[in-house]
């Protein structure tokens, strides 16, 4: 279908600033260093291409992207389909994150990317000091005490954990937006499926300990589970496809060369095998060490302790794809019922994984919900 | 329930050769990845060779060069082909296989390289 590529988006070689600039928009970057180091690039969209007049306060949104991806998600489309451009011209404040160890996020203070040690954490360590440095530093830096979360994917992953471990935290956020949600994996039909029997020591001696690329592990399964099914063969190389699934009919093919050349941005082995940990316990729990010695010198326990959405009081709204294979309907709707504060649900059933952040209908499907209900809550 | 069988390991010279075979019961084509682990006296188990359904393969950096893993799925059997044997190859060798219902281990072959 799309054997070959014909890279006609400028794009494809630009940082998030200049994709930002490239359509006309206001960006500012900065960053921030977390508590242990890591300095992650954010980018801001004060306000959009024909509202810059507007004074006073505007709501505050930040979008945070999910596994195996960057900042680059929420802008990677034409912008009257990039969720970042529409809430900027729907005269929001727009805040893009980045997780440790993507493209844009790969620096530390004390340890080279090269190193070992730069690339030993998982979306724990995502949750526990990327997610409160982040919201930290808007806060101070827009003077507005809360601000709104978009999450997708990995992206709500982090925000379950933060948001109902850290209380202080969980107060500076309005509503937190969940698209494509992730807590336990038990159901996921992702590739990651196929890890989730690898021991620890195989999993490190087949993909290293340090960035993560798919090797060619995943080969075996792609003739037949992925790209004979969609024949897409530009996509069956790239690990954000091959592991959050995609589907033709929603894409916009003529932004494929942005989304291959941005993507995937990069995650620590550690985070994937913690993955495939979640997926073999069918839990939604915290990193296991390995051994109940080394659990106890981390978290003074022999198990890794359970991550409790219960606990989570922001109000929620949740949207769900029918064929997303790693957010599988099941597994949010085991997640559904724990949620004490969900304020809107909203399942679509021909949707993947990929679909909530570049499918065509995306405004249609998700976006303006977002805008709206941003909207009332300023009322 | 896949079960695993090693056999050929022995005691060689340094320099010498040898050619451990793993027999599985069932069919290893199920398998995505089959590994050769080793443990050294006094030493934790640790992978020295794998090879994954795709026929690619990786190896610990001190075998590279000197070991083979390969597998012939009609006879359900994995090899591990260990030329210029060192001392330090010395251990019990255990064949391995990861599929979709779990992570299977043989019993173990003693393999002795003497000085």
């Known amino acids: 279908l799309f054997g070959k590529l014909h890279p006609g988006s400028p794009e494809v070689t630009m940082n998030i600033s200049q994709m930002i600039t490239y359509w006309g928009y206001p960006n500012e970057e900065y960053e921030v260093v977390t508590e242990d180091g890591y300095i992650l690039e954010v980018n801001r969209i004060p306000y959009g291409k024909k509202n810059s007049g507007n004074t006073g306060q505007r709501p505050v949104v930040f979008l945070q992207h999910g596994l195996l991806a960057s900042a680059t998600n929420w802008i990677s489309n034409l912008p009257n389909n990039s969720l970042a451009f529409i809430l900027a011209d729907a005269g929001y404040d727009v805040w893009l994150g980045n997780s440790r160890g993507n493209t844009w996020a790969r620096r530390n203070l004390y340890y080279s990317p090269d190193s070992v040690e730069f690339w030993a954490f998982s979306f724990d360590e995502m949750a526990k000091y990327d997610l409160p440095a982040t919201i930290d530093f808007i806060v101070k830096k827009t003077g507005q005490k809360q601000l709104h979360y978009v999450g997708h994917s990995q992206g709500t992953t982090i925000g379950f954990i933060a948001f109902s471990t850290n209380p202080s935290l969980a107060k500076r956020i309005k509503t937190f937006y969940a698209l494509a949600p992730v807590a336990t994996v038990k159901y996921t039909k992702s590739l990651i499926n196929k890890l989730r029997f690898v021991p620890q020591s195989l999993f490190k001696f087949i993909f290293g300990d340090k960035i993560f690329y798919p090797h060619n592990f995943f080969d075996q399964f792609l003739a037949t589970e992925v790209c004979s099914r969609e024949m897409l063969n530009l996509l069956c190389s790239n690990a954000l496809f091959i592991i959050c699934g995609f589907d033709s009919k929603n894409f916009n093919t003529s932004r494929l060369d942005v989304y291959l050349s941005h993507n995937p941005a990069g995650t620590s082995v550690q985070n994937m095998f913690h993955w495939t940990q979640a997926v073999k316990s069918g839990k939604f729990q915290a990193y296991d060490w390995g051994s109940p010695v080394q659990n106890r010198m981390h978290y003074d326990q022999s198990q890794p302790p359970y991550y409790n959405v219960t606990a989570m009081n922001v109000p929620i709204a949740v949207w769900n794809g029918g064929k997303d294979l790693l957010a599988d309907p099941q597994d949010v709707g085991l997640l559904l019922p724990k949620l004490p504060n969900l304020i809107y649900h909203k399942e679509i059933p021909f949707y993947n994984h990929l679909d909530f952040i570049w499918a065509m209908d995306a405004p249609q499907e998700v976006y303006n919900d977002i805008v709206s209900m941003i909207s009332e809550d300023k009322k | 329930q896949v079960q695993l069988q090693e056999s050929g390991g022995g005691l060689v010279q340094a320099g010498g050769s040898l050619r451990l075979s793993c027999a599985a019961s069932?069919?290893?084509?199920?398998?995505?990845?089959m590994s050769w682990y080793r443990q050294a006296p006094g030493k934790q188990r640790e992978p020295v060779a794998a090879l994954m359904g795709s026929g690619s393969t990786t190896y610990a950096d001190s075998v590279k060069g000197r070991f083979t893993i390969s597998r012939d799925n009609i006879k359900n059997t994995m090899y591990l082909q260990m030329n210029s044997l060192k001392p330090e190859d010395t251990g019990v060798y255990y064949c391995?296989?990861?599929?979709?219902?779990?992570?299977?281990w043989g019993q173990g072959t003693q393999v002795t390289v003497s000085s």
């Open positions: 391995a296989g990861t599929g979709a219902e779990g992570h299977y």
């Open positions: 069932g069919s290893i084509g199920s398998l995505y990845v």
